[in-house]
Interface confidence: low
């Protein structure tokens, strides 16, 4: 199987030789976005409902501290790149750590200047790889010389960087947040009044993957016949996940007898018709 991975992408910008304050950052867990950095609030925030649901507030405090430190580091590095000319420039760092099926680990970071890769580092062996271009060679020399002047940038520092990344990855995996292939649906049930004492109840499932889902109305625990229900197509929602709905008409006052049954990737749930007008129910996001 593909390894579990934690990836951070940070970027700092300079305008006319002046390095801008702040930075851009995002985090991916097993390829899924789980973190974004809010530049206005200067805080790491969950990206996606599943990250918000499972990871506690402490996670975002820790991530904010770490990203702030990394962002400052990257800003300092950008000030030492001698290649600076007028206009807008960017320095980007992508940091990845992986845990493989055989429990072996990998760690690396990659630096891009104006979108061009100029240095890759193996965090475990401290080996560096520099592309052949003269520009990449010059940039890499600039940066590594600057790091050599920094007493903090020792082999121990890089090992700690890798250990810290792996520690987080293991913690996030234990939290059950690493959705490798399955994204459970959000389910909500709504009622709309129609004439003659009948109401239409609609059960909507959204943001799920894979596409296969069972969504059906039950009366007193028994599935309604197909001809009494109307199904929407299972459609992509533009985020790599899917959405669908099922509706049926019931007698007003009999709401308590009806439930929406959802089954998806081995998980299932039953959602009652709300006594008010709208009720949003969220499926437990489990792996």
């Amino acid at each position: 199987a593909e390894p579990h991975s934690l990836r951070y992408n940070l970027m700092v910008l300079s305008q006319d030789e002046s390095v801008q304050s702040g930075f851009l950052a995002e985090g991916h867990l097993d390829g899924q976005p789980f973190l974004r950095y809010d530049r206005q609030k200067r805080r790491a925030k969950p990206q996606g409902q599943w990250a918000e649901d499972v990871l506690g507030a402490k996670t975002w405090d820790t991530e904010t501290e770490d990203l702030t430190e990394n962002g400052q580091d990257l800003r300092r590095t950008l000030t030492h790149i001698k290649d600076q000319k007028g206009g807008l420039h960017s320095l980007q760092e992508i940091r990845v750590c992986e845990i493989h099926e055989d429990s072996s680990t990998r760690g690396s970071r990659h630096f891009y200047y104006d979108g061009e890769l100029f240095l890759s580092q193996n965090l475990e062996t401290q080996e560096s790889t520099v592309p052949q271009s003269s520009r990449a060679q010059t940039l890499a020399m600039n940066v590594t010389n600057f790091w050599k002047e920094d007493a903090m940038k020792t082999k121990t520092h890089y090992r700690a960087m890798q250990a810290d990344c792996l520690q987080k990855l293991q913690r996030y995996l234990k939290s059950g947040v690493a959705i490798r292939r399955t994204v459970p649906p959000m389910v909500n049930v709504t009622c709309s009044e129609v004439s003659e004492g009948n109401i239409t109840v609609t059960c909507r499932a959204s943001s799920f993957y894979p596409r296969n889902i069972t969504l059906t109305w039950r009366q007193d625990g028994v599935s309604l016949s197909h001809n009494t229900q109307q199904w929407g197509d299972v459609l992509p929602d533009g985020n790599g996940t899917y959405q669908t709905w099922v509706a049926t008409r019931i007698r007003q006052g009999e709401e308590q007898r009806f439930t929406c049954y959802m089954e998806h990737s081995g998980n299932h749930g039953t959602h009652p018709v709300p006594s008010g007008k709208v009720l949003v129910l969220q499926s437990q996001r489990t792996d």
Partner: antibody
């Protein structure tokens, strides 16, 4: 309508460099991976690698690591496949294709770019 | 990397007949297997993903089954436009790999 439009056919000499493109439209380009697939004359499909245009994170098939470079410019919704020094064995049709965030297989494909390398 | 072996290499059938194509993986790929159709001069088209899910707009005569190492694509009744090359592809392990293809030709 989702579309991937690739650049036209190329005829090159061995040792020359080349960059072919794939422009996405009709969807959020930064939300989906773009992959590249090779098909040599009369042969099957081979996976080269993939890029996430949102942050240009790339992964290569080990067979093609170091042989090609995959890049993207999200400002113009375009992905690229390039060679610094072409070989006759690079002669093939190259397809770009879109893969969803949740790792769904390639659901939309470009029309293909024929690259011919001959002295 | 995972090797996918498709059989038979060529399948000669008449319109209206049932086609059964096989794809075997060198190790388990769970259900992360897709099937693509390719006609001459065209790009491949996704038919089936995750072993048994039909892609959008694919006719019901196409169905997929299997999990682990053995997978089958079935075309219940061949239409003239179904004569093409079919590839399986796994995405369980990196790198994703394709089978060598099965050509379905008119008998």
């Amino acid at each position: 309508e989702v579309q991937l439009v690739q650049s036209g056919a190329e005829v090159k000499k061995p040792g020359e460099s080349l960059k072919i493109s794939c422009k996405g439209s009709g969807y959020s380009f930064t939300n989906y991976w773009i992959g590249w697939v090779r098909q040599m004359p009369g042969k099957g499909l081979e996976w080269l690698g993939i890029i996430h245009p949102g942050d240009s994170y790339t992964r290569y098939s080990p067979s093609f690591q170091g042989q090609v470079t995959i890049s993207a410019d999200k400002s113009i919704s375009t992905a690229y496949l390039q060679w610094s020094s072409l070989k006759a064995s690079d002669t093939a049709i190259y397809y770009c294709a879109r893969e969803g965030i949740a790792a769904t297989p390639f659901d939309y494909w470009g029309q293909g770019t024929l690259v011919t390398v001959s002295s | 990397e995972i090797v996918l072996t498709q059989s038979p290499a060529t399948l000669s059938l008449s319109p209206g007949e049932r086609a059964t194509l096989s794809c075997r993986a060198s190790q388990s790929v769970s259900s992360y297997l897709a099937w693509f159709q390719q006609k001459p001069g065209q790009a491949p088209r996704l038919l089936i993903y995750d072993a048994s899910n039909r892609a959008t707009g694919i006719p019901a005569r196409f169905s997929g089954s299997g999990s682990g190492t053995d997978f089958t694509l079935t075309i219940s009744s061949l239409e003239p436009e179904d004569f093409a090359v079919y590839y399986c592809q796994q995405r369980s392990n990196w790198p994703p790999t394709f089978g060598q293809g099965t050509k379905v030709e008119i008998k």
